[in-house]
């Protein structure tokens, strides 16, 4: 025979239409409604009777589809552990964290739940820029031609060394990955103790 | 320990309106899981489920009284109700309130039943 | 419109063993439950979902299934059993909750 048209409705093969919105009930062999985002199971179904759903209450949650018999509680971002906030929870989702600036994800299960500082990537080299910030600790790769980086620093970026010409000045010392141009006035000539310095 | 008691009129004039109230003690009948019941047992006979309701209003009725049946809750009262309409003399009975037991359409509480007599 | 079907009456000694049966159509795809009624005094749940005893029901009441028909056992049978005994389950569509038509148990 048909099915019925809306749950509760017997099932034969154990499976139901709408996997993502019903649930077998193994007891009395029947698909019944599963809960929506922010709610929480309030009466469990029979045979007669579909599930009865209600809202989670302040600080908790249901993010999916559910036959939870309540609602998880809304954990706050742990700075010990390096996390701060980016959104608040709602009844629908989960507090959403993120690592603090200056520090990447070391351990993750589902999410994240412990950051750690990003090495230092030391001078002539930046960190590579990733997808999403805080997923990974630095890979240092080496400033391109024409850029240098003179700190060890985790967040530091490559600059594009000096053009002592649009100055109007000369350059004394060619820039190199660790250091910017050399520049100098054109009617000076540079003291030998002066190098990648830059003279008006 | 959660106890049921119904009240109302004993005799009501055919064509007229049932209504019964059951109240609830021992227990809130905003429980999260418990739907209530109404149930009747003509004199001398077997027992007729007429309806449940939880305590946010959701109801289910049987198809046979349905046209003529509303079941309503109070939540600040702790109580349920029963109205029914256009009584004959075939709605004479003793009328159950009773709590079911949570995802089952079984009674595990029962009120000790009202008479109701529909007679002009 | 579904029914349940219990026989009018039941008679046994003490001491012996009582079966009440109750068949329908769909009990193989719904639970039973049994209730013991006394003169005057609401219903009593017995057994639930076929062969469950609430706390407080004696051992000696057991509840079986086969096919379309349940049987509520009653094993060593006392005085105190008279009573009227009703079985419940759903209509075939399971939109509606149905009573058997009762049994007396008679203690002889």
């Known amino acids: 025979s048909q099915p019925q048209a809306v749950p509760p409705y017997a099932s034969e093969n154990q499976t139901c239409r709408d996997q993502e919105k019903e649930y077998y009930e193994p007891q009395h062999r029947i698909c019944c409604s599963r809960c929506p985002p922010g709610t929480y199971v309030s009466a469990k179904c029979s045979r007669i009777r579909d599930t009865v759903c209600a809202t989670c209450a302040e600080n908790s949650y249901n993010e999916h589809w559910n036959y939870l018999t309540i609602c998880q509680l809304c954990r706050p971002c742990d700075p010990v552990m390096g996390l701060e906030e980016i959104a608040p929870c709602t009844s629908k989702r989960k507090t959403q964290c993120r690592c603090q600036p200056g520090m990447f994800c070391a351990a993750w299960a589902l999410e994240c739940t412990h950051c750690e500082l990003l090495s230092d990537c030391p001078p002539g080299t930046e960190a590579e820029l990733k997808d999403e910030v805080g997923k990974g600790n630095n890979h240092c790769v080496p400033c391109k031609a024409g850029h240098f980086q003179n700190t060890s620093s985790p967040s530091a970026r490559c600059q594009p060394h000096t053009r002592c010409e649009n100055q109007g000045l000369v350059e004394a010392a060619p820039g190199t990955a660790q250091s910017d141009t050399t520049c100098k006035n054109p009617l000076e000539p540079l003291p030998p103790e002066m190098s990648g310095t830059m003279l008006m | 320990q959660v106890q049921l008691q119904e009240s109302g009129p004993g005799l009501v004039k055919p064509s007229q309106t049932l209504s019964l109230t059951c109240t609830v003690s021992?227990?809130?009948?905003?429980?999260?899981?418990?739907?209530w019941s109404w149930i009747r047992q003509h004199p001398g006979k077997g027992l007729e489920w007429i309806g449940f309701?939880?305590?946010?209003?959701?109801?289910y009725y049987n198809p046979s009284l349905q046209s003529r049946v509303t079941i309503s809750v109070d939540t600040s009262k702790n109580q349920f109700s029963l109205k029914l309409n256009s009584v004959t003399a075939a709605d004479t009975a003793v009328y159950y309130c009773?709590?079911?037991?949570?995802?089952?359409?079984?009674?595990?509480?029962w009120g000790q039943g009202t008479m109701v007599t529909v007679s002009s | 419109s579904y029914e349940l079907t219990q026989p009018p009456s039941v008679s046994v000694s003490p001491g012996q063993t009582a079966r009440i049966t109750c068949s329908g159509d769909a009990l193989p795809q719904h639970y039973t439950y049994w209730y013991q009624q006394k003169p005057g005094q609401a219903p009593v749940l017995v057994i639930y979902k076929d062969n469950e005893r609430p706390s407080g029901i004696p051992e000696r009441f057991s509840g079986s299934s086969s096919g379309t028909t349940v049987t509520l056992t009653i094993s060593g049978v006392q005085a105190e059993d008279e009573a009227d005994y009703y079985c419940q389950s759903a209509d075939i569509s399971g939109t509606y909750v149905v009573f058997g038509g009762g049994t007396k148990l008679t203690v002889l």
């Open positions: 009773a709590r079911v037991i949570p995802g089952e359409d079984a009674f595990d509480i």
């Open positions: 309701i939880y305590f946010t209003g959701i109801t």
């Open positions: 021992g227990g809130s009948i905003s429980s999260d899981g418990y739907f």
